[in-house]
């Protein structure tokens, strides 16, 4: 028997957040915050002995949750 169609959302795509579009989802504290409380990290200088800089879709710093801790800047998707 054939399977039904796959979900339209890719397996690795971020799930919709409970935030209204005016806010962003802080993955660390797992709730919505003003987007200005999330901070995009500055890439490390070239040649620095560290992993590649994180992209905007990967965990990044959150001023609201304490600098250096993980957060995802997911604008509200309602």
């Amino acid at each position: 028997m054939r399977r039904g169609p796959r979900s339209l959302r890719g397996r690795d795509a971020p799930a919709p957040t409970p935030c209204v579009p005016a806010e962003c989802f802080d993955l660390l504290v797992r709730h919505c915050v003003a987007c200005g409380l999330l901070r995009t990290p500055r890439p490390k200088p070239a040649g620095a002995s560290s992993p590649a800089p994180r992209t905007a879709l990967q965990p990044q710093e959150s001023v609201g949750a304490g600098a250096g801790e993980a957060a995802l800047p997911l604008p509200g998707l309602l």
Epitope: A22, C24, A34, L37, L38, L78
Partner: antibody
Framework: EVKLVESGGGLVQPGDSLSLSCAAS????????MNWVRQPPGKALEWLGF??????????EYSASVKGRFTISRDISQTIVYLQMNALRAEDSATYFC?????????WGQGTSVTVSS | DIVMSQSPSSLAVSVGEKVTMSCKSS????????????LAWYQQKPGQSPKLLIY???TRESGVPDRFTGSGSGTDFTLTISSVKAEDLAVYYC?????????FGAGTKLELK
Amino acid sequence: EVKLVESGGGLVQPGDSLSLSCAASGFTVTDYYMNWVRQPPGKALEWLGFIRNKANGYTTEYSASVKGRFTISRDISQTIVYLQMNALRAEDSATYFCTSYKNAMDYWGQGTSVTVSS
Amino acid sequence: DIVMSQSPSSLAVSVGEKVTMSCKSSQSLLYSGNQKNYLAWYQQKPGQSPKLLIYWASTRESGVPDRFTGSGSGTDFTLTISSVKAEDLAVYYCQQYYTYPLTFGAGTKLELK
């Protein structure tokens, strides 16, 4: 038709408490956060705070000017939002608006007037 | 707190004229995660409650006439009315929702010459 209707305003004395209500209809209230904003006569708008939706556990944010004195809450049906104001001061005299909050402050009520005077 | 500064505070115009008003924020309202500016414009007519005109600095709210245009990025924003109508006479407020507390400008009052 979208409707936000505030009520509960009036004349009170300094130090008194007052509770304002905002009844919402005509849109999916559960999708929205709800704000309270005030406007003293002839002056600019001031944001007081908001309450998030059910999906966010009705969490709140407040302006420093009212934090600890004012409390925003929602009823179980989510269609009514309250602003509980304690220890009122003369400078709290204003028209109080409730607004929905999604892309910005999308819908506004007509406002209810609060006068704090002895 | 982010301070929103609007200029001019009042503006005398004739019907049919093009009008621009300015809003400046004390810090950038551009969120690099989505390249959106967290700025809105509202119109408040005498004796009425405010009405949302523009959000994300340049997105017109549904039902708002296309003579209203929002532009700008970062800290400098402009609301333009391409051809003023008598019904546009009002106070216009900008507001940031980039961070708490949400803050409004003092408004620009549009009056008839």
